[in-house]
Amino acid sequence: QEGKFSGPLKPMTFSIYEGQEPSQIIFQFKANPPAVTFELTGETDNIFVIEREGLLYYNRALDRETRSTHNLQVAALDANGIIVEGPVPITIKVKDINDNRPTFLQSKYEGSVRQNSRPGKPFLYVNATDLDDPATPNGQLYYQIVIQLPMINNVMYFQINNKTGAISLTREGSQELNPAKNPSYNLVISVKDMGGQSENSFSDTTSVDIIVTENIWKAPKP
């Protein structure tokens, strides 16, 4: 009987998760005489196969990061190999799984900030990439400061924009940073995928060395 997994030759789209071991057929095309066999062409990548009887399947796990959409064509052939139906487009959309970890572009960043700089104004950006689909949580990155050294009175002088990786001073940092007292700081920054919301997220860390420079601007005397 015709149904979800079998039917006549017509344009179709299928969505398959990447990374899954091939476990079932994609579709069973039905031949109408004089068609006796089927032919598959297009972006098969030697993964997609159609058997003589019209059984379309894949023989190894897909990888969205290699190809996110496979554009295939299926034709029905007669007993002389001549196309009697089609070719029709068959689109395989490869759905993303979280199979890639975010990675900082640099293992170490260096920057400088002037004392009394405006809080919230970025003076340095850290940047990570993730090969997973940015339209899904798998590729949505979340930055945070893990450690600030030194940490004086348990006060954070630096903050990071969780989405953009922009580092700036906190209000306390703007008021209290003094190169005469502490000319340099080190931050350990982490990035997580899944928007930072899952225990199953992947993460990476990087080190940021920050030099505090003196504010040479003096208020004019009255």
Partner: antibody, heavy 119, light 112 residues
Framework: QVQLVQSGAEVKKPGASVKVSCKAS????????IHWVRQAPGQGLEWMGY????????KYNEKFKDRVTMTTDTSTSTAYMELRSLRSDDTAVYYC????????????WGQGTTVTVSS | DIVMTQSPLSLPVTPGEPASISCRSS???????????LYWFLQKPGQSPQVLIY???NLASGVPDRFSGSGSGTDFTLKISRVEAEDVGVYYC?????????FGQGTKLEIK
């Protein structure tokens, strides 16, 4: 080895019919199509049509479709081509040929049957 | 119908010399699967046709490797690297991309 053996020469009068046979051996008869091609004296080759012995499906050249019938007898692995309403310009050598499934080419031809149409 | 045009129609060749036969189709015989549906065969005097080349460039089983086929979607060439006496006969190209199958007029190869 694979062979196609055709019936002997025929002499026919205009308006009559002729039925040429082609006996296959050395392979599974129902696996491959049998085609008929003719060659008039001093002329080129002309494809007449084919039959698929597995299901009896036929396709004919439009030029012959009203006058030709192709059949098979799978019990004897024999293909037949009947041409009706013969005219003098049907005088030709008629060949059967096996079209190799999956490789898609004529790999074996019969020896040919001469059909002469003359009053 | 697809028209197949061969040239030359007659080809006198000295044994041991190369020979080349051209065939042109009125429509591309290249299909999206990458195959070109052109077939070359030889009809020796008084004999049935015999296959030489299938799908433009594939040498059929038992055919000497002095025969080769090449071409594009519409222009095809059959080459014989060194002609031998046994190669005489009429050479035909044929398309089987679509029905009706159609043939070239034939090229008669003869020994000088």
């Amino acid at each position: 080895q694979v062979q196609l053996v055709q019936s002997g020469a025929e002499v026919k009068k205009p308006g009559a019919s002729v039925k040429v046979s082609c006996k296959a051996s050395g392979y599974t008869f129902t696996d491959h199509t049998i085609h008929w091609v003719r060659q008039a004296p001093g002329q080129g080759l002309e494809w007449m049509g084919y039959i698929y012995p597995r299901d009896g499906y036929t396709k004919y050249n439009e030029k012959f479709k009203d006058r030709v019938t192709m059949t098979t007898d799978t019990s004897t692995s024999t293909a037949y081509m009947e041409l009706r309403s013969l005219r003098s310009d049907d005088t030709a050598v008629y060949y059967c040929a096996r079209f190799y499934y999956g490789y898609w080419y004529f790999d074996v031809w019969g020896q040919g049957t001469t059909v002469t149409v003359s009053s | 119908d697809i028209v197949m045009t061969q040239s030359p129609l007659s080809l006198p060749v000295t044994p041991g010399e190369p020979a080349s036969i051209s065939c042109r189709s009125s429509k591309s015989l290249l299909r999206s699967n990458g195959n070109t549906y052109l077939y070359w065969f030889l009809q020796k005097p008084g004999q049935s046709p015999q296959v030489l080349i299938y799908r433009m460039s594939n040498l059929a089983s038992g055919v000497p490797d002095r025969f080769s086929g090449s071409g594009s979607g519409t222009d095809f060439t059959l080459k014989i690297s060194r002609v031998e006496a046994e190669d005489v006969g009429v050479y035909y190209c044929m398309q089987h991309l679509e029905y009706p199958f159609t043939f070239g007029q034939g090229t008669k190869l003869e020994i000088k």
